[in-house]
Amino acid sequence: EVEKTACPSGKKAREIDESLIFYKKWELEACVDAALLATQMDRVNAIPFTYEQLDVLKHKLDELYPQGYPESVIQHLGYLFLKMSPEDIRKWNVTSLETLKALLEVNKGHEMSPQVATLIDRFVKGRGQLDKDTLDTLTAFYPGYLCSLSPEELSSVPPSSIWAVRPQDLDTCDPRQLDVLYPKARLAFQNMNGSEYFVKIQSFLGGAPTEDLKALSQQNVSMDLATFMKLRTDAVLPLTVAEVQKLLGPHVEGLKAEERHRPVRDWILRQRQDDLDTLGLGLQG
């Protein structure tokens, strides 16, 4: 906390400029008007202030806006965003995607911090749902963002937003999350033709039920083993040997290498040995 002292004669800041880097902390506190700072926030990051000086500037903004900063200030926080606490951010009302992007840029290359998580939460709650543009932005900065949401939170994702999802965005999703996302993806991609549909739906198939897998097996999709291994065990078990053979196409030979792993192991145990023998892979039920 900087002591309250009068500003020395001739040192009152007329604008936020480079001359302020020579000010001691108490001089910044005494000589920089908080309202001036708020209107010229866009200049602050281009000036090489020390971290201690930036703390003083943050303190001035806190005093000016005890109920939370306006968006016009938030958008230009730059480095100061990293000095905000989640408690600070909970007071904000961020509605502009441009503001969100500006702050995510500051944290780029770092893990999702508690500050960023709070900011995103505030933004999404303010919008009421995860629309496509927001999801596009969030997954661009944090590919794992979607899988960090609970199934309940994912239920607010409209099917139209699924178009923004890339395969890598689903890498860390668990089956419960894919159970929520798959029906949305199915709806989003329903008007695509067979091969294009499969390319899009493939990443979401960990949430697919048996009947959809049976339908896919009729479409010559040639599912790779990596995708097959991510399918729900309970969805795979009822599939016949013929259906799995059609589903995997030339990749069916890969079952041998995965015969001790789920869901292949459990599926093998459910099949008649005669049917397994038709594959010619030496699978033992």
Epitope: N45, A46, P48, F49, T50, Y79, A102, E105, K108
Partner: nanobody
Framework: QVQLVESGGGVVQPGRSLRLSCAAS????????MHWFRQAPGKERELVAG????????YYADSVKGRFTISRDNSKNTLYLQMNSLRAEDTAVYYC???????????????????WGQGTLVTVSS
């Protein structure tokens, strides 16, 4: 990542000169700044002098103008502070600091990351 190591401090009589050096390991670019700060016992750290590398401009605190000169040897990646006409009030720990511009990439925005040396003590005493 930049590491800074200061040297050249010591005890000197009032009116004499001293030259401080700051060796930087890592890359310093045109968008960056190099500064000398000092902190006297019981006082706040203050900026003494700086260089804007991109524009090749130099700036000084009023208290050292005309007495101190900041310079940089690009080939050695070293920053210097030539201190002449030293006074008792110049006694302090002197720190070298690199302010490295971190651009956002997708826009012209960015901010300064700061790296600090451990400091070197200068004592001006008769």
């Amino acid at each position: 990542q930049v590491q800074l190591v200061e040297s050249g401090g010591g005890v000197v009589q009032p009116g004499r000169s001293l030259r401080l050096s700051c060796a930087a390991s890592g890359s310093i670019f045109e968008s960056d700044r190099m500064h000398w700060f000092r902190q006297a016992p019981g006082k706040e750290r203050e900026l003494v002098a700086g260089i804007n590398i991109g524009t090749n401009t130099y700036y000084y605190a009023d208290s050292v103008k005309g007495r101190f000169t900041i310079s940089r040897d690009n080939s050695k990646n070293t920053l210097y502070l030539q201190m002449n006409s030293l006074r008792a009030e110049d006694t302090a720990v002197y720190y070298c600091a690199a302010f490295l511009w971190k651009s956002y990439g997708s826009s012209d925005g960015g901010y300064y990351l700061q790296y600090w040396g451990q400091g070197t003590l200068v004592t001006v005493s008769s």
